[in-house]
Amino acid sequence: ESGYAQNGDLEDAELDDYSFSCYSQLEVNGSQHSLTCAFEDPDVNTTNLEFEICGALVEVKCLNFRKLQEIYFIETKKFLLIGKSNICVKVGEKSLTCKKIDLTTIVKPEAPFDLSVIYREGANDFVVTFNTSHLQKKYVKVLMHDVAYRQEKDENKWTHVNLSSTKLTLLQRKLQPAAMYEIKVRSIPDHYFKGFWSEWSPSYYFRTPEINNSSGEMD
């Protein structure tokens, strides 16, 4: 006979897979940091399940997460950002699974914004610029950016360019003439912090000039 049959919810809970992943966002709201966790399995029954972080906190021993639909979330100034914290999934006072995590190694930057492309006729190139909120931050200032662009008709044929600045020049001769292009950008911590790619910026669309038949140049 199964040892799980007598005591309802708690024993049933121990049969489930409660593996989870988290990411931090530093100085996401002024000097406030955030931590977001979610279960790997979207079908986990999250009723009565809570997340708690303990250790490497300022002035408190532990903090509880707020639940927002299927994610668990904290926004606070109380992350020490030095050393490891223990993040646990709990039901009541019982911990079902825990992870030791240094919050500076799971940083997900904010998505870049204000992406734009300007065509320079004299230079025969396109200047790509974008902005990032991280230029103003105390901690996660150094990012690697991934600019991805494609001809709109090529569904999955993205060209990627990695750069550390927020400006990129695309040569006109490397692009198809009279074509519509989609371009987007994302960021990842590069020095002093580790973590994950940000969400993609909103896409920007631009059209390349036609070829001028007399010279073989694009208009």
Epitope: K100, D102, Y139
Partner: nanobody, 118 residues
Framework: EVQLVESGGGLVQAGGSLRLSCESS????????MGWFRQAPGKGLEWLAA????????HYSDSVKGRFTISRDNAKNTVYLQMNSLRSEDTGRYYC???????????WGQGTQVTVSS
């Protein structure tokens, strides 16, 4: 077996400077937080400064803020404490600690003595 070794202590006049070093033989040094503590004669252990694995994040106690600077060199497995404007009350044994894991420092050195004379 020795895992954390402090050096750089000594006798210094008030107002002077010293630089303490702590070399680690722990394999996870470059991903571990590091800290400095001291124990003054007849007193308990006092936390002074801490630094994250990359050196990007540092914290100081009010008693040393603005006078002491913690830094690290992950290529040399070493953490430093630069101590300026030393005072007689800074006298004590200085210890480094490694791997701040859920509010507990996992490894400790044997300490180095600092004496500030007035």
């Amino acid at each position: 077996e020795v895992q954390l070794v402090e050096s750089g202590g000594g006798l210094v006049q008030a107002g002077g400077s010293l630089r303490l070093s702590c070399e680690s033989s722990i394999s996870t040094f470059s991903s571990d937080a590091m800290g400095w503590f001291r124990q003054a004669p007849g007193k308990g252990l006092e936390w002074l400064a801490a630094i994250g694995w990359s050196g990007a994040v540092t914290h100081y106690s009010d008693s040393v803020k603005g006078r002491f600077t913690i830094s690290r060199d992950n290529a040399k497995n070493t953490v430093y404490l630069q101590m300026n404007s030393l005072r007689s009350e800074d006298t004590g044994r200085y210890y480094c600690a490694e791997d701040y894991d859920t509010d507990v420092w996992q490894y400790w050195g044997q300490g180095t003595q600092v004496t500030v004379s007035s």
